[in-house]
Interface confidence: medium
């Protein structure tokens, strides 16, 4: 008799999920000498232990603590780049500017980037058919709780000037409900962080508006200021030129505002 399986609204676990996590871990630890001590089999066991046999709507940050411990990593606290709704450009930037780091440049972020996973209560099976959707099903699902946990820790580690890349093409440039707006902003430590500098990335070719005056950016400024952190905002009018100038800052076309 086929066992009844809960149908969730979101896509199921990414195919070959265990193999993918393990392979990513091996690759990361080979590339990053400071993480060579990490035992990837133990990392996978801890990752698996966080959600296997547990109800996928009842996951807690506590479930991920063994994984967090194994993935403990020190990145330069003054070189952190946060992002919201503009992941690709943020990653392109840190690939060129190798001394700055997004969450996905850390081991734990790298392992989970773009993956989905969940299990089932009381069975050791991974659910490849469907997983809970944050809105339609539940917020305490394995993927959401993972990103909330690692994002909080990443923000807590930040110091000095923290940069955040925001998508100027969206109706809410700063969205209080995004991971940045709901987790990272509130976990920056005022005793360590002097300034949050927002880079608002323009989408349109001829868009010369000052998006730093957008009401949602003013809302971000207000939240940050109330936390005794200074706020700064810059428009990046030409993201293509921005990347080009990061690659080659001495280029004559990079002497003007980007």
């Amino acid at each position: 008799v086929p066992r009844w399986r809960q149908q969730w609204s979101g896509p199921g676990t990414t195919k070959r999920f265990p193999e993918t996590v393990l392979a990513r871990c091996v690759k990361y630890t080979e590339i990053h000498p400071e993480m060579r001590h990490v035992d990837c089999q133990s990392v996978w066991d801890a990752f698996k232990g966080a959600f296997i046999s547990k109800h996928p709507c009842n996951i807690t940050e506590e479930d991920y603590q063994p994984l967090m411990k194994l993935g403990t990593q020190t990145v330069p606290c003054n070189k952190i780049l946060l992002w919201s709704r503009i992941k690709d450009l943020a990653h392109q930037f840190t690939q060129v500017q190798r001394d700055m780091f997004t969450l996905e440049d850390t081991l734990l972020g790298y392992l989970a980037d773009d993956l989905t996973w969940c299990g089932e209560f009381n069975t050791s099976k991974i659910n490849y058919q469907s997983c809970p959707d944050w809105r339609k099903d539940c917020s305490n699902n394995p993927v959401s709780v993972f990103w909330k946990t690692v994002s909080r820790r990443f923000a807590e580690a930040a110091c000095d000037v923290v940069h955040v890349m925001l998508n100027g093409s969206r109706s809410k440039i700063f969205d209080k409900n995004s991971t940045f707006g709901s987790v990272e902003v509130h976990n920056l430590q005022p005793e360590k962080v002097q300034t949050l500098e927002a880079w608002v990335i323009h989408g349109g070719r001829e868009d010369s508006r000052d998006l730093c005056q957008d009401p949602t950016i003013k809302e971000l400024e207000s939240i940050i200021s109330k936390r005794n952190i200074q706020f700064s905002c810059k428009n990046i009018y030409r993201p293509d030129k921005f990347l080009q100038c990061v690659k080659n800052p001495e280029d004559s076309s990079c002497t003007s505002e980007i």
């Epitope: 003054n78 500017q97 001394d99 000037v161 500098e197 700064s232 990061v246 800052p249 001495e250 990079c254």
Partner: nanobody, 123 residues
Amino acid sequence: DVQLVESGGGLVQAGDSLRLSCAASGRTFSSYAMAWFRQAPGKEREIVSSISTSGGITDYADSVKGRFTISKDSAKMNTVYLQMNSLEPEDTAVYYCAARTWYLRTSLQYDYWGQGTQVTVSS
């Protein structure tokens, strides 16, 4: 790490000139973008001028444009200068040298700071 030591400050009359120097030791310095900041009593620290890694790009605050010139020592590349002409009482401040590992106008991020040198301009 990089250590920065400023010199050349002092007391001058309005209209006079001063040349500040910032000498760096430690890691290879030629790969650093540099800047001069200043902080007047009771005011926030502000950027005065910046220069890119090779010295090819320079930037100035509006208040000093045409009067101040930033440069890097082309031979050693481990010293950056701020030539200050036509000094005004409003230029009175502690001047700080700063360095960072990459140059982009958008960023406030400077990794290394000197202790500062006092510049006083009397009227």
